[in-house]
């Protein structure tokens, strides 16, 4: 191009204003409404309506004139209800009477199919602590737990660890103030993400892996029941629930002496075809580096809050950014990939299968994932969960974006980072971070209490608009948050990932570990090497910062080399010592398994609290491998091997 034809350089303030003005004229509500029309609801993964919506999104992406639009097909196994209904009954201990409590309308996917009978014990939310605090032993008994606090899968895993034989989950009125006591709800019990029958590898049609089964699948039956059914069970139970549970007055602890509860689950496995829909706006400088923006499309019930809001945000952001590029002169350096996932309700299956399909290369190309799921569940609070690499970006964005109702900046607490909650299994950002080592962020406008209708037949547009009358304003704010992330991540020459944040994460871990230095000394071990690895990581981050300061920002080759070092930071916190098939969530900070730093600390605690459960050999391994993982991250960040100080 001639110099005269050069596109004028757009700066952050120009782009921020451009984004804001475009979002001002966007009608998010009508898109959310459209996604809740009969043609697209209900849209259980793999159903015709899920596919209808996939086609619609693909079409919309094409109409947005994205650089490229494509789809990925996966064949996955899910579990659905059988025509033979699941049941909960109360029986006399000698079967002198049988009383049907409920044939529930909902179910829990990936439950074990079985019929079990026994005493029923209330275990509050089913957390590890809840089970520890119980007076009644649960081994050989069924447990009933309240929905909330932790995922269904964690509740079931905890119950199984306590040797319970089955689990019932209900929504109490105190935590979920739903008028209709008969509302049924859905969830899944896979302590993991992706297709549990292809753990750690992708389920493309042509991949012929031997039959396999995720270790995160439960071995006991689990079933959701309505509040009305729970109350019928409580009528046959005794012992008031502790007042500090803050639950309904009807709550009772254990079945009466002469009564048993029978749970019968007979769900069926079903292989389905799911579609992930993608569209990309190609970067002008580094098109092979991209930020991924994604939303779950499927839903068991109507899914207004669960999947329609996120999908609407995805569609509107695709349109907005496409306009900014095609009409307004925005030239992102890096690419933006828009992704609509299916089978999210079964444990981020679509997202995980995509990650599994490109495990060896994705972390070299995708440098951030922005999750749009459940971004609007209320108005009062702005909450975020993310990799520490994104904290600086989040803080800048919170300072720039105003609260949709109060008009004040979202940045109201300088200590916000210390209150960030870890990403959990039920968040699509989790596998990006913990499985693939790609920095990820998930955020929401929400209330102090849970949005009561998620996963229920009442997650309708009507309830959403009645609960959040300012829906359009709040959705606009959510789009602005995501949009600012997208601009900052694709526009700035220097990658907006704050690699120095992991210094404080490492320091915090060492501080916690230091409390047990006497134990470590008694085992003849030293923390010297761990301190040394942390020191090397600190020096590597300082050196990288210096390299950035000293580099010529216009030298694309140098900047790409430096940015590539930054991109690898998260990935190098994936433990190289465990198999992605056996322990898919390899991240030592955010993953799950004995390789994680939190598992190492929990294990070490046992040396004092439950010495028989402590395994010194395992601990020595944990400490050595954690040390080497951190050292490896430091080495990777340092750059070329001739720059690495090998005193280790």
């Amino acid at each position: 191009k001639d110099d005269d034809d050069k596109v004028p350089q757009l700066y952050w303030d120009d782009l921020k204003k451009m984004l804001s003005e475009k979002l001002d004229t966007t009608d998010f509500t009508s898109t959310i409404k459209l996604l809740n029309e009969n043609s697209y609801v209900p849209r259980e993964a793999g159903s015709q309506k899920d596919e209808n919506l996939a086609w619609y999104i693909e079409n919309q992406f094409r109409e947005c004139k994205l650089s490229k639009v494509w789809r990925d097909e996966h064949f996955v196994k899910i579990q659905v209800k059988d025509s033979a209904q699941n049941s909960v009954t109360i029986t006399g201990t000698n079967s002198e009477f049988v009383y049907l409590v409920e044939n529930p309308g909902g179910y829990v996917a990936y439950s074990q199919n079985a019929t079990v009978t026994g005493k029923l014990v209330h275990a509050n939310f089913g957390t590890e602590k809840d089970f520890e605090d119980l007076d009644s032993p649960v081994n050989g008994s069924l447990v009933i737990v309240r929905a909330g606090k932790i995922t269904f899968a964690e509740k079931v895993a905890n119950a199984e660890s306590a040797n319970a034989i089955g689990v019932l989950i209900y929504m109490d009125k105190t935590k979920f103030p739903i008028v209709d006591a008969d509302v049924s709800f859905f969830g899944h019990a896979h302590l993991g993400t992706g297709d549990p029958y292809t753990p750690g590898f992708p389920s493309f049609n042509h991949t012929q892996f031997p039959p396999s089964r995720s270790s995160g699948l439960p071995n006991i039956p689990v079933q959701t029941i309505s509040r009305a059914a729970a109350e019928r069970l409580f009528e046959n139970m005794e012992g008031d629930c502790p007042s500090d549970w803050k639950t309904d007055s009807s709550c009772r602890m254990v079945t009466s002496q002469n009564k048993s509860v029978k749970l019968s689950v007979s769900n069926v496995m079903k292989e389905i075809k799911i579609l992930n829909i993608f569209g990309v706006i190609k970067g002008f400088v580094e098109p092979d580096r991209y930020v991924v923006v994604g939303a779950q499309r499927d839903s068991w019930g109507p899914g207004a809050a669960k999947s329609s809001v996120g999908t609407a945000l995805l569609l509107e952001l695709a349109q907005t950014f496409s306009d900014m590029v095609l009409k307004d002169g925005f030239q992102p350096s890096r690419s933006i990939v828009f992704a609509s996932w299916s089978a999210g309700d079964f444990g981020s299956v679509g997202a995980t299968e995509w990650l599994e399909g490109y495990l060896s290369s994705l972390h070299l190309k995708a440098f951030t994932f922005i999750n749009l799921d459940k971004a609007v569940l209320g108005t009062s609070n702005f909450r975020v969960s993310a990799s520490p690499l994104l904290y600086a970006l989040i803080e800048k964005t919170m300072q720039e974006v105003k609260h949709p109702v109060t008009g004040l900046s979202l940045y109201q607490d300088s200590n916000w980072a210390s209150k960030v909650e870890k990403l959990t299994f039920d968040n699509a950002a989790f596998p990006f971070l913990a499985y693939s080592g790609i920095p990820a962020v998930s955020f929401c406008f929400c209330e102090d209490t849970d949005y009561p209708y998620l996963g229920t037949t009442m997650d309708t547009y009507k309830e959403l608009i009645e609960k959040i009358p300012q829906l359009n304003k709040v959705a606009r704010a959510a789009a602005e948050v995501a949009g600012q992330f997208m601009i900052k991540l694709t526009h700035d020459v220097e990658l907006n990932l704050d690699y120095e944040r992991y210094n404080s994460q490492l320091l915090s871990f060492l501080r916690n570990l230091n409390q047990y230095r006497a134990d470590i000394r008694e085992m003849g071990l030293s923390l010297q090497w761990l301190y040394s690895a942390r020191g090397d990581f600190f020096r590597a981050t300082s050196r990288l910062t210096t390299d950035f300061k000293n580099s010529e920002k216009t030298d694309r080759f140098v900047m790409k080399e430096l940015n590539d070092r930054v991109m690898k930071v998260e990935y190098y916190f994936l433990s190289p010592y465990v198999s992605p098939r056996e322990s898919p969530f390899r991240h030592i900070f955010w993953g799950s398994g004995s390789h994680t730093l939190s598992a190492l600390l929990e294990h070490l605690k046992l040396r004092k609290t439950n010495n028989r459960a402590f395994n010194e050999t395992l601990f020595r391994n944990q400490l050595a491998l954690a040390t080497w993982t951190i050292q490896g991250a430091a080495n990777a960040l340092s750059g070329d091997i001739w720059d690495i100080d090998n005193e280790f």
Epitope: S30, K33, N36, E37, N38, Y40, V41, A304, K462, E463
Partner: antibody, heavy 121, light 106 residues
Framework: QVQLQQWGAGLLKPSETLSLTCAVY????????WTWIRQPPGKGLEWIGE???????NYNPSLKSRVTISVDTSKNQFSLKLSSVTAADTAVYFC???????????????WGQGTLVTVSS | SYEVTQPPSVSVSPGQTASITCSGH??????ACWYQQKPGQSPVLVIY???KRPSGIPERFSGSNSGNTATLTISGTQAMDEADYYC?????????FGGGTKLTVL
């Protein structure tokens, strides 16, 4: 094809209780909103209230203190009682089935034939 | 409380397009439906979910809803379309009807 057939007293004195019944033929009773709507002569439609399949009821706030809607599922029937009627309650009373759509909103897809109730001393 | 407003009457010549409006605060955020009522008869649902037609309703009936206004449009109006038309929506667990519009086919 679903049909709604309604009956009840057509002439009442002030302070009496209006009582109407609606029978549902040819369709399931569960999963719908069984509703009463009225229309004063020459005027528009006014929603009175509904019985929801789960067992709860919803009433128009302006009539709430006087209205009771009940259901006899064994007979596929639902009833309206409006106490302490006055001349202002003179209207054609319709029973209707509310069908919820995917959005959680609902519309009335089947209606009874209507019963004219006159309140006069 | 929430109110929706309709014009009391609309006139149209046969074959022309008739538009009946229904206005309410942010009505476009809700779903609206429309009923046709002929003298001495029960109302009949003609549009639900803003723009969907129940089976048996002619294609000339269409609906839209955005901003503060829902609109029922009858294209190629016929004499048999002369009737009262009511819009309906929801607000806070209460069914809300518009006051009705008398459509006259001249």
């Amino acid at each position: 094809q679903v049909q709604l057939q309604q009956w009840g007293a057509g002439l009442l004195k002030p302070s009496e209780t209006l009582s109407l019944t609606c029978a549902v033929y040819g369709g399931s009773f569960s999963g719908y909103y069984w509703t009463w709507i009225r229309q004063p002569p020459g005027k528009g439609l006014e929603w009175i209230g509904e019985f929801i399949h789960s067992g709860s009821t919803n009433y128009n706030p302006s009539l709430k203190s006087r209205v009771t809607i009940s259901v006899d599922t064994s007979k596929n029937q639902f009833s309206l009682k409006l106490s302490s009627v006055t001349a202002a309650d003179t209207a054609v009373y319709f029973c209707a089935r509310g069908s919820m759509d995917s959005s959680g909103f609902y519309s009335f897809d089947f209606w009874g034939q209507g019963t004219l109730v006159t309140v006069s001393s | 409380s929430y109110e929706v407003t309709q014009p009391p009457s609309v006139s149209v010549s046969p074959g022309q397009t008739a538009s009946i409006t229904c206005s309410g605060h942010k009505l476009g955020d809700k779903f609206a439906c429309w009923y046709q009522q002929k003298p001495g008869q029960s109302p009949v649902l003609v549009i639900y979910q803003d723009r969907k037609r129940p089976s048996g309703i002619p294609e000339r009936f269409s609906g839209s809803n955005s901003g503060n206004t829902a609109t029922l449009t009858i294209s190629g109006t016929q004499a048999m379309d002369e009737a009262d038309y009511y819009c309906q929506t929801w607000y806070s667990s209460t069914v809300i009807f518009g006051g009705g519009t008398k459509l006259t086919v001249l």
